[in-house]
């Protein structure tokens, strides 16, 4: 009796089970009662990453430098090329088809996590006792100056955007 279902890594065609082509190879011809499935390796610029019956291999992704992309990992016959963004840029999506500049953290915010080629800068508000007076993609919130350790007193309180202003202690005569 002809099969109605096939084993893993097989497919049903013309009432018989044929072997799928292994990753890195494409289908040339289906199996017959006399021959196995005929497969051919993908060319240098192509890949197939699963057991398959595809008659065409997929083109490797192109990391377009005009979009700020660069190759992170060269593709093989079994894997696609992985793109990442040039320095100062990060991917706009998981598939990394284009890049945008990293955002800077505004004054009053510091960098919690520096951006990578695939993720943007993560900012956090400066908590009490810390400040940031610059717009930066690298700088964390800095602690207020400790006037006491300098034998000075606070003349002007700090904010999340400004440091405290220290001054000499008043000498009572």
């Amino acid at each position: 009796e002809p099969p109605t279902a096939c084993r893993e890594k097989q497919y049903l065609i013309n009432s018989q089970c044929c072997s799928l082509c292994q990753p890195g190879q494409k289908l040339v011809s289906d199996c017959t009662e006399f021959t196995e499935t005929e497969c051919l390796p993908c060319s240098e610029s192509e890949f197939l990453d699963t057991w398959n019956r595809e008659t065409r291999c997929h083109q490797h992704k192109y990391c377009d430098p005009n979009l700020g992309l660069q190759v992170q990992q060269k593709g093989t016959s079994e894997t696609d090329t992985i793109c990442t963004c040039e320095e100062g840029l990060h991917c706009t999506s998981e598939s990394c088809e284009s890049c945008v500049p990293h955002r800077s953290c505004l004054p009053g915010f510091g960098v919690k996590q520096i951006a990578t080629g695939v993720s943007d800068t993560i900012c956090e508000p400066c908590p009490v006792g810390f400040f940031s007076n610059v717009s930066s993609a690298f700088e964390k919130c800095r602690p207020w100056t400790s006037c006491e350790t300098k034998d000075l007193v606070v003349q002007q309180a700090g904010t999340n955007k400004t440091d405290v202003v220290c001054g000499p202690q008043d000498r009572q005569r």
């Epitope: 040339v28 009662e33 006399f34 005929e38």
Partner: antibody, heavy 117, light 107 residues
Framework: EVKLVESGGGLVKPGASLKLSCAAS????????MSWVRQNSDKRLEWVAS????????YYPDNVKGRCTISRENAKNTLYLEMSSLKTEDTALYYC??????????WGQGTSVTVST | DIVLTQSPATLSVIPGNSVSLSCRAS??????LHWYQQKSHESPRLLIN???QSISGIPSRFSGSGSGTDFTLTINSVETEDFGIYFC?????????FGGGTKLELK
Amino acid sequence: EVKLVESGGGLVKPGASLKLSCAASGFTFSNYGMSWVRQNSDKRLEWVASISSGGDDTYYPDNVKGRCTISRENAKNTLYLEMSSLKTEDTALYYCTRAGGKAMDYWGQGTSVTVST
Amino acid sequence: DIVLTQSPATLSVIPGNSVSLSCRASQSIRDNLHWYQQKSHESPRLLINYASQSISGIPSRFSGSGSGTDFTLTINSVETEDFGIYFCQQFNSWPLTFGGGTKLELK
């Protein structure tokens, strides 16, 4: 018991035609692909033709394409090989074989074809 | 066409000894290879399919190995009934092709 019995061989002149038959028994003939394989005096084996179980698909090597026709009559459990424009190099023992698991799992005893002037 | 080259052409052996027969393909055929045995005045019979899978009714002293382009048929402790010609056959692609055979004879 699987049995394949070839017949129809003989001595013919170059350019002549011949039709070989293979009577199959001991299995469901219509469920199996069948092939013809020949063996020359040097004992070399050469695939000649194959036909799918239903008879819809036929396969030939280039050196016999157009000169050989494989066919089957499932109702009669019989396989055929019609050969025309015979050449001296077609001289061989012709075997009928059954295709099981993509192998030639059963062979007949062969029928001899001699092409000579 | 895929060419199968068998070596040696002839192999002389003493019963009880073990032998290895080689079959080399002109390009990769994965494991799509069968082995056949033909005794004197008999038809060929299937010994091994898919390069290494044993066939029901065939003595366990026969085993096959290999993949890609290099294949081996091993006969452990040859018996007198094993003398004859051994053929490999590829079924990776059309046309189906056979090796030239290795004749196993008594030393």
